[in-house]
């Protein structure tokens, strides 16, 4: 009679993570008597996957009833496959022995490859806000995919970015892989409504890439521009001075009026108006009683935006000897070009 052969007809099996893998194995003879065992890997470091004699195998089932006397089908199914299950599986026939069974013949092996989807890309931006014209870095991470081949692209408002670096780890063989990419983005004043998108394409996604997004509103700080103007005289001895705070983001802003360097009033921006580009405008006014001043008055609008050092704009009110004769053009002179930092 011909000697027993162990036949594993499939050289390789490809399974998606979460599915069930069927590893086929048949023997050509019932002799010699002894159990079948399945191993992953070969040599002394192999892992026992299934033992016909004993053991508990929550994820492994046999295709046929191994207790039947003339059974020669030793195929198994492994459920809920993960990338960690990848490897070469060997069906091994043992000959009954004492005290131990002796390995008799092995199949040629079946390589199990696992396709696993990448996790949803997570995009993160810089820890601190940055102003327009600055370059900021965004990172994108995705994990747990297999095989290793993967494509990652960056977009800003639908336009593909080119300044980025991508690494796939580990470099060598692994059960699953991770991708990490860093993109550099130059901010503009119009970026409050902008989005940065990281797009990952993988064989498991069937042409439907995964995307992670970051809103530049979380990253950008647009500093305000200030304009101090004097309004026409409201009453005989009163001058209305306004401070226009324009095109700032985010909204967090505190304004202080100074009269000759002394704090007159402090207020926080509340009822702001929003521009189309997502930035904000705000106006504050100060009513100055000219008759209370014997000398010229230096009015300063000082703005602290988003915790940054204060910026200011000043306006000189000329107090004339004859306030009743003042017109809107002669009552004060606007010298609001004096913009400076106050620390």
């Amino acid at each position: 009679e011909e000697e027993l052969q162990v036949i594993q007809p499939d050289k390789s099996v490809l399974v998606a993570a979460g599915e069930t893998a069927t590893l086929r194995c048949t023997a050509t003879s019932l002799i010699p008597v002894g159990p079948i065992q399945w191993f992953r890997g070969a040599g002394p470091g192999r892992e026992l996957i299934y033992n016909q004699k004993e053991g508990h195998f929550p994820r492994v089932t046999t295709v046929s009833d191994l207790t039947k006397r003339n059974n020669m089908d030793f195929s198994i199914r492994i459920g809920n496959i993960t990338p960690a299950d990848a490897g070469t599986y060997y069906c091994v026939k043992f000959r009954k022995g004492s005290p131990d069974d002796v390995e008799f013949k092995s199949g040629a092996g079946t390589e199990l490859s696992v396709r696993a989807k990448p996790s949803a890309p997570v995009v993160s931006g810089p820890a601190a806000r940055a102003t327009p014209q600055h370059t900021v870095s965004f990172t994108c991470e995705s994990h747990g995919f297999s095989p290793r081949d993967i494509t990652l692209k960056w977009f800003k408002n639908g336009n593909e970015l080119s300044d980025f670096q991508t690494n796939v780890d580990p470099v060598g063989e692994s059960v699953s892989y991770s991708i990490h990419s860093t993109a550099k983005v130059v901010l503009t004043r119009e970026d409050v409504h902008s989005q940065v998108i990281c797009e990952v394409a993988h064989v498991t996604l069937q042409g439907d890439p995964l995307r992670g997004t970051a809103n530049l509103s979380e990253t950008i700080r647009v500093p305000p521009t200030l304009e101090v103007t004097q309004q026409p005289v409201r009453a005989e001895n009163q001058v209305n001075v306004t401070c226009q705070v324009r095109k700032f983001y985010p909204q967090r802003l505190q304004l202080t009026w100074l009269e000759n360097g002394n704090v007159s009033r402090t207020e926080t921006a509340s009822t702001v108006t929003e521009n189309k580009d997502g930035t904000y405008n705000w106006m504050s006014w100060l009513l100055v009683n000219v008759s209370a001043h014997r000398d010229d008055v230096k009015l300063t609008c000082q703005v602290e935006h988003d915790g940054q050092p204060a910026v200011s704009k000043s306006h000189d009110l000329k107090v004339s000897a004859h306030p009743k004769e003042q017109g809107s053009n002669t009552a004060a002179e606007n010298t609001g070009s004096n913009e400076r930092n106050i620390y």
Epitope: E54, G55, P58, I78
Partner: nanobody, 124 residues
Framework: QVQLQESGGGSVQAGGSLRLSCVAS????????MGWFRQAPGKEREFVAG????????YYADSMKGRFTISRDNAKNLVYLQMNSLKPEDTAVYYC?????????????????WGQGTQVTVSS
């Protein structure tokens, strides 16, 4: 070289539960098959449960089947033994063991490394 450190032992009433943990260091944990053994006073060390390196196959001594569950967390280098419905005869020092090769319940002969043990006392 592999270092093994057991924890989670203690005293419990009959019918109670305990979970033993064993942390391994010094070698890639996912290349080691792991097992638990116990030694009662005046008796030989006996096999309790074993688990293959990926956790796909598990083995239990007949008297522990259905009461004890072995599991592992390869990310944390940990192997666990959940012991339910404990009996006074389960009182022993429980040892964690690591093997480079694993042949099911032949694990005692294949264990290359042993922990110091943790005492489990079950009173009636």
């Amino acid at each position: 070289q592999v270092q093994l450190q057991e924890s989670g032992g203690g005293s419990v009433q009959a019918g109670g539960s305990l979970r033993l943990s064993c942390v391994a260091s010094g070698r890639t944990f996912s290349s080691l098959d792991m097992g638990w053994f116990r030694q009662a006073p005046g008796k030989e060390r006996e096999f309790v449960a074993g688990i293959s390196r990926s956790g796909i196959s598990q083995y239990y001594a007949d008297s522990m089947k259905g009461r004890f569950t072995i599991s592992r967390d390869n990310a944390k280098n940990l192997v666990y033994l959940q012991m339910n419905s404990l009996k006074p005869e389960d009182t022993a020092v429980y040892y964690c063991a690591a093997a480079l090769t694993f042949r099911g319940s032949d694990l005692p002969r294949d264990s290359n490394y042993w922990g110091q043990g943790t005492q489990v006392t079950v009173s009636s």
